[in-house]
Interface confidence: low
């Protein structure tokens, strides 16, 4: 399945609108700095394989989609880079999910793929504990908007790398 | 309880132009995504637009691109439907509708819907 | 686009029966779809929400399933004030299907 050409676009846009959401100083969030584990060697192995790799990324992106169209998120972000940013990540589900439906439907996807997906889910099974206990205040917040920075800046790095490989 | 009361229907001649208004009621309504939804006679439901809460971003159906303008007035809790160059198959009955997630322009199927106000298009 | 295909078109039941209506995308949806009833002059009513949650109000006879690219509504006994049109919806680019009409058999 090939991406669309814009899709790398789509997800520097979705980066820089992330960047844009940032309310406080990290810096001043110092205190409440969390390793939350990604999952780094989902993402960045040189064995993956593709049709994995992207509905690897299609976790990835629906449970950043499903963490900031929560009401919690609401309250703690201008409504229209929130708007802005959940839509850009709409339209990459939806380039996605047409990529993964293709791959399942000429039977490219393993089975070993299953692990993957749990680590991503468990990843951010931790960032959500993570603002429950603190309450969803404006630093876990900063904490999390900076996690998901990093984490969207590897699928990037990953999606590229594919790319390449077409 | 949520309400969502319309008005500005009528019959107009094919090229005429219509603006449809949904006042809102019992629910903060610049919290929402809103859409407008219509359904030709004795056919089924077809989504038109959706504008984000701000206002700033918007969407149509393929059909209405560049002839109906979706806007919004939150201070006054208003949805607004601009229809311009109405064609004969633009005649329906077109409900606005609030969405049952607030956030984005993606709803979870849209749980609060106005009673529906006929526009017909016709010479 | 995204189409979406329901079937039955109509639906010939009796009261107690037991009802399943089908709605496929034309590519995955993930659970993004929603089901409505419409009685005529009426406006859509709010059935099932993401797949297969159900809305606030609505008895417990309605159940949704399915994800990726087919749904079902299932109604479990069949009510009089069941006898209604059903649309599903897809919110992904907010298509709906065409709708089914259950009627009185």
């Known amino acids: 399945c090939d991406l669309p050409e814009t899709h790398s676009l789509d997800n520097r846009r979705t980066l820089m609108l992330l960047a844009q959401m940032s309310r406080i100083s990290p810096s001043s969030c110092l205190m409440d700095r969390h390793d939350f584990g990604f999952p780094q060697e989902e993402f960045d192995g040189n064995q993956f394989q593709k049709a994995p790799a992207i509905s690897v990324l299609h976790e990835l992106i629906q449970q950043i989609f499903n963490l900031f169209t929560t009401k919690d998120s609401s309250a703690a972000w201008d409504e229209d880079l929130l708007d802005k940013f959940c839509t850009e990540l709409y339209q990459q589900l939806n380039d996605l999910e047409a990529c993964v439906m293709q791959e399942e439907r000429v039977g490219e996807t393993p089975l070993m793929n299953a692990d993957s997906i749990l680590a991503v889910k468990k990843y951010f099974r931790r960032i959500t504990l993570y603002l429950t206990e603190k309450k969803y205040s404006p630093c876990a917040w900063e904490v999390v908007r900076a996690e998901i920075m990093r984490s969207l800046s590897l699928s990037t790095n990953l999606q590229e790398r594919l790319r390449r490989k077409e | 309880d949520v309400q969502l009361l319309q008005s500005g229907g009528g019959l107009i001649q094919p090229g005429g132009s219509l603006r449809l208004s949904c006042a809102a009621s019992?629910?903060?309504?610049?919290?929402?995504?809103m859409s407008w939804v219509r359904q030709a006679p004795g056919k089924g439901l077809e989504w038109v637009s959706v504008?984000?809460?701000?206002?700033?971003?918007?969407d149509y159906v393929d059909s209405v691109k560049g002839r109906f303008t979706v806007s919004r007035d939150n201070s006054n809790n208003t949805l607004f439907l601009q229809m311009d160059g109405l064609r004969a198959d633009d005649t329906a009955i077109y409900y606005c509708a609030k969405p049952k997630d607030m956030i984005v322009v993606v709803p979870a199927g849209f749980d609060s819907w106005g009673q529906g106000t006929l526009v017909s298009v016709s010479s | 686009d995204i189409q979406m295909t329901q079937f039955p078109s109509t639906l010939s039941a009796s009261v107690g029966d037991s009802v399943t209506i089908t709605c496929r995308a034309s590519?995955?949806?993930?659970?993004?779809l929603a089901w409505y009833q419409q009685k005529p002059g009426k406006a859509p009513k709010l059935l099932i929400y993401k797949g297969s949650r159900l809305e606030n109000g609505v008895p417990s006879r309605f159940s949704g399933s399915g994800s990726g690219t087919e749904f079902t509504l299932t109604i479990g006994s069949l009510q009089p004030d069941d006898f209604a049109t059903y649309y599903c919806q897809q919110y992904k680019t907010w298509t709906f299907g065409q709708g089914t009409k259950v009627e009185i058999k």
């Open positions: 019992g629910f903060t309504f610049k919290d929402y995504a």
């Open positions: 504008i984000s809460r701000s206002g700033n971003i918007v």
């Open positions: 590519q995955s949806i993930s659970a993004w």
